[in-house]
């Protein structure tokens, strides 16, 4: 009886694992083995595919074959008993194009209200992704074990921290890799679960803000308790993108080590131009808080996002405010080459009731004022870019009296 050649050959490539699967064409024939040959582009001869010779099952692994993953190859298969079937040729393919990204390795660390996720490629020193290893980004799905309500987090790097979690709560997550340059989305990792710790005695500092005063940066934060000492550390933001790097070498800001106030001042020349991450930790001498959430700090924007300068033209029932470019030391105007939005706060001098106007324009009318009344105005600028959500400090307040009731010009 003639042996039929096998059919429906599937090539599965995950990372550096090359798997072939096929269907037997004749289930009734026993003791059949299968063998594969391969052919590289531009070659006439077929070569025996090591790892896939005289196979009794319908699956084989040819991962040991050292292929150029960017080069097209062709496969053929036949069945063998006493005689052999004809060859069945598989459509040619390029391994890299066919390859899927395997599940990444995930390692979790817990704090009371945060989880640190370390992610690394599932295959160490992968040949398939050798040229793309630095381009991996990851996304994850996280949920409380008790509720199952999922939250997705996209575009994260090899180490990511999730904040604002509940203490003593089990969270589960799964992670997958992507190579956006090659339009490849990977396979999810197994589900990993971790329980956050009991609530720490000391909470981390909150609401960290950086502003510029004279030639200094002023870093401020909020803290629940008094009589604490604080330390501040910085890190180059680009280091977060380095996939092989699990050691983030956070550095102390010398003027912000063991400070006893909820702010510290340090010279602008501490930082060269660039984007940094900052974090703050509190201590009462016996206990230490976990680190605060990291804030992004861009020296370019921070240095130049100075409070706006404005002139007021007073009328009887309104102010006309003309916003100009802020002045640097030396009285030269600063060129702001990104769109700004202005927040104007005004109040009656004798009252604490503040009113607010948000405007994109640089000429603003403050309406509904009382005649012959002193009003005070202060303003600050915000960047309109969500990613670089920065605000200047408020300008000094300027107080003016409205004109008598009959003037409207």
């Amino acid at each position: 009886k003639n042996l039929k050649s096998p059919q429906k050959v599937e090539v599965d490539i995950i990372d550096d694992n090359f798997i072939l699967r096929w269907n037997r064409s004749d289930e009734s024939v026993g003791n059949v083995t299968f063998s594969f040959d391969y052919q590289k582009t531009g070659m006439d001869n077929w070569i025996k595919l090591s790892g896939c010779q005289n196979i009794t099952s319908t699956k084989c692994n040819f991962s040991s074959l050292k292929l150029n993953v960017y080069e097209e190859i062709k496969l053929r298969i036949r069945a063998e008993k006493e005689n052999t079937s004809s060859w069945y040729e598989v459509d040619s393919f390029t391994p890299f194009r066919k390859a899927q990204i395997g599940p990444p390795e995930v390692h979790l660390e817990a704090e009371d209200k945060a989880i640190v996720i370390h992610i690394s490629p599932g295959t160490k020193d992968s040949v398939m992704w050798a040229l793309d290893g630095l381009s991996f980004t990851y996304s994850l799905v996280i949920w409380k074990n008790s509720s199952g309500v999922e939250e997705r987090i996209e575009n994260i790097y090899s180490r990511h921290k999730i904040y604002k979690l509940s203490p003593e709560t089990t969270y589960c997550l799964k992670v997958k890799a992507a190579l956006l340059t090659s339009w490849k989305i990977g396979v999810y990792s197994p589900v990993h679960c971790i329980k956050t710790t009991v609530e720490n005695e000391l909470p981390p500092p909150e609401n960290i803000e950086v502003s510029v005063q004279n030639q200094n940066y002023v870093l401020k934060w909020d803290y629940t308790y008094a009589n604490m000492t604080f330390q501040v550390q910085w890190l180059h933001a680009f280091l977060k993108r380095n996939p092989g790097n699990h050691l983030y070498k956070w550095k102390q800001i010398p003027d912000c080590e063991n400070v006893k106030t909820t702010q510290c001042v340090f010279p602008q020349n501490v930082f060269q131009k660039g984007i940094y991450l900052l974090r703050v930790q509190a201590s009462d001498g016996n206990n230490t808080s976990f680190w605060s959430e990291e804030i992004k700090f861009d020296t370019e924007i921070q240095a130049f996002l100075l409070p706006p300068v404005f002139n007021i033209r007073s009328l009887s029932d309104s102010f006309h405010i003309y916003i100009g470019a802020p002045k640097q030391s030396g009285n030269t105007p600063v060129i702001q080459d990104y769109p700004l939005i202005y927040e104007i706060i005004f109040w009656e001098n004798t009252s604490n009731a503040e009113r607010k106007i948000i405007e994109k324009k640089t000429d603003v009318t403050v309406p509904n004022l009382k005649p012959l009344t002193v009003y005070c105005v202060k303003a600050r600028a915000h960047t309109m870019d969500e990613k670089l959500n920065k605000s200047s400090v408020f300008s000094d307040a300027v107080c003016e009296k409205t004109k008598p009731g009959n003037t409207s010009k």
């Epitope: 390692h107 979790l108 660390e109 817990a110 704090e111 009371d112 370390h118 971790i194 710790t197 009991v198 720490n200 005695e201 790097n245 699990h246 050691l247 983030y248 070498k249 550095k251 016996n286 206990n287 230490t288 976990f290």
Partner: antibody, heavy 118, light 107 residues
Framework: EVQLQQSGAELVKPGASVKVSCTGS????????IHWVKQRTEQGLEWIGR????????KYAPKFQGKATITSDTSSNTAYLQLSSLTSGDTAVYFC???????????WGQGTTLTVSS | DIVMTQSQKFMSTSVGDRVSVTCKAS??????VAWYQQKPGQSPKPLIY???YRYSGVPDRFTGSGSGTDFTLTISNVQSADLAAYFC?????????FGGGTRLEIK
């Protein structure tokens, strides 16, 4: 293969100083922190401090501030622990260890025995 | 400084038994705890990092658990090769600190 090779045993007189070395192979010390740990005979482990060989930044346990000085030389892939004003209390085995922020102290040197005796 | 307390200095067990070595931190250290095994005349051998992750090559008889302030190293199916001292260490805050050690003796 990753290894930390420490210098040999030292016998020194009280009041003197000693410098112990720890040379890394199979990795670049600049990419890690190198820590030093003290162990007295039949005792526990005491953390002395660490260095970031990339820029020389150090941290010390308060107890060893003034006693220990940690330095490094990236050209020879070596970290050093210098101990000054030695007393019998400094007689111990000193270990260096590598830290990568993920696996904690994943590789240790074989230890250097320091004996302070007149 | 954070104090790591291993209350049992010595523990006696038999081959095939299961034994738990405990370690208590004086304040919350998250899961930044490692465990080391040390045999006489040798340097400490890393067993566990991040509370529960085994280093490669460490038999799965060794498991770590806990979080916050209470941590445990469990050795199941104890072997005579496990006769050693075991140290916990916190690396959440400087100065890093070790427990005093627990010496495992085989009956």
């Amino acid at each position: 293969e990753v290894q930390l090779q420490q210098s040999g045993a030292e016998l020194v007189k009280p009041g003197a100083s000693v410098k112990v070395s720890c040379t890394g192979s199979g990795f670049n010390i600049k990419d890690y922190y190198i820590h030093w740990v003290k162990q007295r005979t039949e005792q526990g482990l005491e953390w002395i401090g660490r260095i970031d060989p990339e820029d020389g930044e150090t941290k010390y346990a308060p107890k060893f501030q003034g006693k220990a000085t940690i330095t490094s030389d990236t050209s020879s892939n070596t970290a050093y622990l210098q101990l000054s004003s030695l007393t019998s209390g400094d007689t111990a085995v000193y270990f260096c260890a590598r830290y990568d922020g993920y696996y904690c102290f994943d590789y240790w040197g074989q230890g250097t025995t320091l004996t302070v005796s007149s | 400084d954070i104090v790591m307390t291993q209350s049992q200095k010595f523990m006696s067990t038999s081959v095939g038994d299961r034994v738990s070595v405990t370690c208590k931190a004086s304040q919350n250290v998250g899961t930044n705890v490692a465990w080391y095994q040390q045999k006489p005349g040798q340097s400490p051998k890393p067993l566990i990092y991040s509370t529960s992750y085994r280093y490669s090559g460490v038999p799965d008889r060794f498991t770590g658990s806990g979080s916050g302030t209470d941590f445990t190293l469990t050795i199941s199916n104890v072997q005579s090769a496990d006769l050693a001292a075991y140290f916990c260490q916190q690396y959440n805050n400087y100065p890093y600190t070790f427990g005093g050690g627990t010496r495992l003796e085989i009956k």
